[in-house]
Interface confidence: low
């Protein structure tokens, strides 16, 4: 009984001079924070240089300030006890951890490249002033059909599947318009598809006989061993848009 | 004891570049800022930038801004001074030397010649 | 103000005091606690002699002394010896969180 009461004494006495013991073995432990423990003089609390911090106590070395410069811009002074913090310049957008890096910002509809500021392709879209232009969204997918369509500042609106738009049913979104008893939208979607199918034909012939009178057969051989390539919108420069998959942003402007 | 032995002499063209290296030992590495002097000769000493081992970061004489890296690895508990775009005026003998508001312990110094 | 202004030269003879002074600004010398000396022999690397404005490293000769007014210190060494001859230096940490160097004073021992 005896034993087990000396037992409690010793670790209340240990854990009462814990922080006592502690102090006395590593001094730098009672340095705050915006001071470093300075081994060169005998581990008393020095004051961090100017242009330095110590943002916890018991450092032994402070931290050399974060210099916002160039592209970076002073959002928050450095201070004894707290880095400073950086945002970027107009025209340019935070990147990373802390805004480690600033990119480019580009308009609405369009995406930063390689090449700088591209407008979206046809389909595709971006809201904002940074990030890539995103694919439209395919309405179909989810049996809708587009209510607006999309441009490269905004995204469709699917609304309602035409089966929904029945007389009974009720919508914030217009009627349909009216279609002729009798045909189906399938029926509809096949002569529409029957119909493009015969004018890319017809269109393809008139190029190739033009191509044959105009270049002769070189030509016509040459064409048939180019790569299918993805026809560009007509109403875009060639080089207008930026056609790429997502990936990984370029980091702009890292200092 | 405390030791800073840095790298040896070096000959360079101009608009080369320059890395000298000091490798501390006798002390915690990380526990000490790294200062870089140069002395031109028969000039006094210059400043040219500080690093903190034990985070990285650095700040530099206005001088030297865009030319000057410093860097540590503190696997090996060494320290580099890169100067890039060389100039016949960088001709000097370049020192690290240990300390935060003074230099407390220097290393040998290291002649870097710059020459076409 | 890129450098702290010292004398070029100062000498003395054996047994005297000299007195180098550093006149800086208000954004170093009279900003910083880290006001320091070196002694600087041809061929060596620099040394620290004086730190905080007056404080000496262990192993340093009691005969070199620093003191701070204003936005001037001074460093002052009393019983002049041979080996005294070198060049001095001081330098002080900036408000701007970079370190600059005096133009450096050149002690002759007559």
């Known amino acids: 009984m005896g034993n087990s009461c000396y037992n409690i004494v010793a670790t209340l006495l240990l854990v009462l001079n814990f922080e006592r013991t502690r102090s006395l073995q590593d001094p730098c432990s009672n340095c705050p924070a915006g001071t470093f423990c300075d081994n060169n003089r005998n581990q008393i609390c020095s004051p961090c240089p100017p242009n330095s911090f110590s943002s916890a106590g018991g450092q032994r070395t402070c931290d050399i300030c974060r210099q916002c410069k160039g592209v970076f811009r002073t959002r928050k002074e450095c201070s004894s006890t707290s880095n400073a913090e950086c945002d970027c310049t107009p025209g340019f957008h935070c990147l990373g951890a802390g805004c480690s890096m600033c990119e480019q910002d580009c308009k609405q509809g369009q995406e930063l490249t390689k090449k700088g500021c591209k407008d979206c392709c046809f389909g595709t879209f971006n809201d904002q002033k940074r990030g890539i232009c995103r694919p439209w969204t395919n309405c179909s997918l989810d049996g809708k059909s587009v209510l607006v369509n999309g441009t490269k500042e905004r995204d469709v609106v699917c609304g309602p599947s035409p089966a929904d738009l029945s007389p009974g049913a009720s919508s914030v979104t217009p009627p349909a318009p009216a279609r002729e008893p009798g045909h189906s939208p399938q029926i509809i979607s096949f002569f529409l598809a029957l119909t493009s199918t015969a004018l890319l034909f017809l269109l393809f012939f008139l190029t190739l006989r033009f191509s044959v009178v105009k270049r002769g057969r070189k030509k016509l051989l040459y064409i048939f061993k180019q790569p299918f390539m993805r026809p560009v919108q007509t109403t875009q420069e060639e080089d207008g848009c930026s056609c790429r998959f997502p990936e990984e942003e370029e980091g702009g402007c890292e200092l | 004891q405390v030791q800073l032995v840095q790298s040896g002499a070096d000959v360079k063209k101009p608009g080369a570049s320059v890395k000298v290296s000091c490798k501390a030992s006798?002390?915690?590495?990380?526990?000490?800022?790294m200062h870089w002097v140069r002395q031109a000769p028969g000039q006094g000493l210059e400043w040219m930038g500080i690093?903190?081992?034990?985070?990285?970061?650095?700040s530099y004489a206005q001088k030297f801004q865009g030319r000057v890296t410093m860097t540590r690895d503190t696997s090996t508990s060494t320290v580099y001074m890169e100067l890039s775009s060389l100039r016949s005026e960088d001709t000097a003998v370049y020192y690290c030397?240990?300390?935060?508001?003074?230099?407390w312990g220097w290393g040998q110094g290291t002649l870097v010649t710059v020459s076409s | 103000q890129s450098v702290l202004t010292q004398p070029a030269s100062v000498s003395g003879y054996p047994g005297q005091s000299i007195t180098i002074s550093c006149i800086g600004s208000s954004s170093d010398v009279g900003f910083s606690q880290y006001v320091s000396w070196y002694q600087h022999h041809p061929d060596r690397p620099p040394k620290l002699i004086i730190y905080d404005v007056s404080n000496r490293p262990s192993g340093v000769s009691d005969r070199f002394s620093g003191s701070k007014s204003g936005n001037t210190a001074s460093l002052t060494i009393s019983g002049l010896q041979a080996e005294d001859e070198a060049d001095y230096y001081c330098?002080?940490?900036?408000?701007?969180?970079?370190?600059?160097f005096g133009t450096g004073t050149k002690v002759t021992v007559l």
């Open positions: 690093i903190n081992p034990s985070g990285g970061s650095t």
């Open positions: 030397a240990r300390g935060v508001g003074e230099l």
């Open positions: 006798g002390y915690t590495f990380t526990s000490y800022y």
């Open positions: 330098s002080s940490y900036r408000s701007s969180g970079t370190y600059v």
